[in-house]
Amino acid sequence: IWELKKDVYVVELDWYPDAPGEMVVLTCDTPEEDGITWTLDQSSEVLGSGKTLTIQVKEFGDAGQYTCHKGGEVLSHSLLLLHKKEDGIWSTDILKDQKEPKNKTFLRCEAKNYSGRFTCWWLTTISTDLTFSVKSSRGSSDPQGVTCGAATLSAERVRGDNKEYEYSVECQEDSACPAAEESLPIEVMVDAVHKLKYENYTSSFFIRDIIKPDPPKNLQLKPLKNSRQVEVSWEYPDTWSTPHSYFSLTFCVQVQGKSKREKKDRVFTDKTSATVICRKNASISVRAQDRYYSSSWSEWASVPCS
Amino acid sequence: RNLPVATPDPGMFPCLHHSQNLLRAVSNMLQKARQTLEFYPCTSEEIDHEDITKDKTSTVEACLPLELTKNESCLNSRETSFITNGSCLASRKTSFMMALCLSSIYEDLKMYQVEFKTMNAKLLMDPKRQIFLDQNMLAVIDELMQALNFNSETVPQKSSLEEPDFYKTKIKLCILLHAFRIRAVTIDRVMSYLNAS
């Protein structure tokens, strides 16, 4: 058993049918010695008396808010949460496996640049009685500071019969140099509590591996005289690291017909313009990627050919 | 260490091309190592990220773009020097950069070259003959060093009398390739910045 926060305790249980559970001793936070009784949650049934209460915690029915009283007055509370260990592996019931980029990915994180700011998000089908708390650091043995905000509900989607809820959090490394070569990964730890169930999820990454630039901005077309060709031009996104000559991007320009089946023409360039043939009803899209370190491509910025 | 001698070059910043080749070569080699050594811990998540140049060179600090010198987090161990010669720089463009930066890059390359050659010698003794260093990568390191044109003491290749532990050597190869790839990215960024300056 360990303390999650004041008066909230997590009991770690080896979770299998008929498991013996864990013996837990609760102590009433009071100078009083006599006439103390204990109850669980809203029940008025007296579970025991005395300054300490010894319980065998086996299932969720044994978890909850234990309260010690004296003469109708509440003295203190202890909330017991359960953390299930199923065959040596901590349970992951609360969050959905996003399966990207690999199986068992519960937290996904992205950064728009090398400033040390990043966003993480996760999915759940649970809509109520759910709280999250996020901590982060650079490295784990001698951790350096990363400050995270509060997790907020950022999106709701309908997936088949289920509703899916997306939560996200923004974090900022306290003293980040965009040009630094990372040798210690960023660690992100999310505590999730659903009713009386506690779970924790972690992710470890280098900022360089989670870079995803914003799409190029000011995408424009300039028709070339007496030709079906157009000059496409664009600019680096505002959120990208500067100077751009040091933090360079490379670009992919795509001409896509109305039908998804039509052949796509693609051009790769390090410049911020390209000459392409504009077909009728086609659209031109441009996306960006770090020129020197192949992390994710940005989303497409698009303009119609007409 | 001798300071570099500037050789006027009216054309494009000549080291940019070499540094791009370097990044391509080390990325290819790392990919090959990951595939060939699939049963070894060779991914970015599995290896310890060691930097053999730590405390010996200061490439990131010495080559910091002027725009980032205002960022206190980038200035922890910054040694500033505005001596600006080096054959990669056309003489009229030298005012933006430090010789320290280019000499630091040169020292990095030299250290990695020695490590890679020592390691290759060990890998050649492996009866499994599982993986060797790409000669193209070694050649590209050499070409960039020549383009940088620093005269510096040759570091003798480390020789080891004891029987090599091939498992450890292969893991060390992965660690070295990951670190060198990250340094090659920095070098490429620096060359691109200098080319634009």
Epitope: Y16, P17, D18, T125 | -
Partner: antibody, heavy 115, light 112 residues
Framework: QVQLVQSGGGVVQPGRSLRLSCAAS????????MHWVRQAPGKGLEWVAF????????YYADSVKGRFTISRDNSKNTLYLQMKSLRAEDTAVYYC????????WGQGTMVTVSS | SYVLTQPPSVSGTPGQRVTISCSGG????????VKWYQQLPGTAPKLLIY???QRPSGVPDRFSGSKSGTSASLAITGVQAEDEADYYC????????????FGTGTKVTVLG
């Protein structure tokens, strides 16, 4: 004590369907994940499928994906395996099993796929 | 499709020490704990070892398990005639959990 009693096995022709049941008692069935494992005659153990305690997530071996469906009825304390498009290579003893460091197995039920 | 490799058979005379190996990889045994099962003919598997080296109550102490790196082993110290059975190791793969990964199985024969 914990008990898992299986039923539903038998002889079936290729291409046909069969449903296996596993009735649980002696524990809070709705709190635990459950597996199906099979063993072809003279062969080793092969995992077939898993279902979470609340039925929210199901996982399948590639060899049965799209043909077999694992389900549970927590109100009846019963686990099911619906098997469709059966093949000769599905012939095996099928076991249900609780998920956890200490596990309990059903007695097994034989499924024979033969024409 | 078995990723955990065991020797097909091992044998020993009563009182001898018999060991069975189970070889896997970084993503399974290297990252997760190992269980061992005993299966007597015509019966369901019985748990002998969980968590690499833990014995459930009721399992004789002549059975012991260990794990090192990407391999695990089961030792029967002072093998007895009633130990003649098939033995399976089991673990998980970190990418496909909760799918169970079983070893190929080992037939233990007690001679004489």
């Amino acid at each position: 004590q914990v008990q898992l009693v299986q039923s539903g096995g038998g002889v079936v022709q290729p291409g046909r369907s069969l449903r296996l049941s596993c009735a649980a008692s002696g524990f809070t069935f709705s709190s635990y994940g459950m597996h199906w494992v099979r063993q072809a005659p003279g062969k080793g153990l092969e995992w077939v499928a898993f279902i979470r305690y609340d039925g929210s997530n199901k996982y399948y071996a590639d060899s049965v994906k799209g043909r077999f469906t694992i389900s549970r009825d927590n109100s009846k304390n019963t686990l099911y395996l619906q098997m469709k498009s059966l093949r000769a290579e599905d012939t095996a003893v099928y076991y249900c099993k609780t998920h956890g460091s200490h596990d309990n197995w059903g007695q097994g039920t034989m499924v024979t796929v033969s024409s | 499709s078995y990723v955990l490799t065991q020797p097909p058979s091992v044998s020993g005379t009563p009182g001898q020490r018999v060991t069975i190996s189970c070889s896997g990889g970084r993503s399974n045994i290297g990252s997760n704990s190992v269980k061992w099962y005993q299966q007597l003919p015509g019966t369901a598997p019985k748990l002998l070892i969980y968590g690499n080296d833990q014995r459930p109550s009721g399992v004789p102490d002549r059975f012991s398990g260990s794990k090192s790196g990407t391999s695990a082993s089961l030792a029967i110290t002072g093998v007895q005639a009633e130990d003649e059975a098939d033995y399976y190791c089991q673990s998980y793969d970190r990418g496909t959990h909760p799918a169970l990964l079983f070893g190929t199985g080992t037939k233990v024969t007690v001679l004489g």
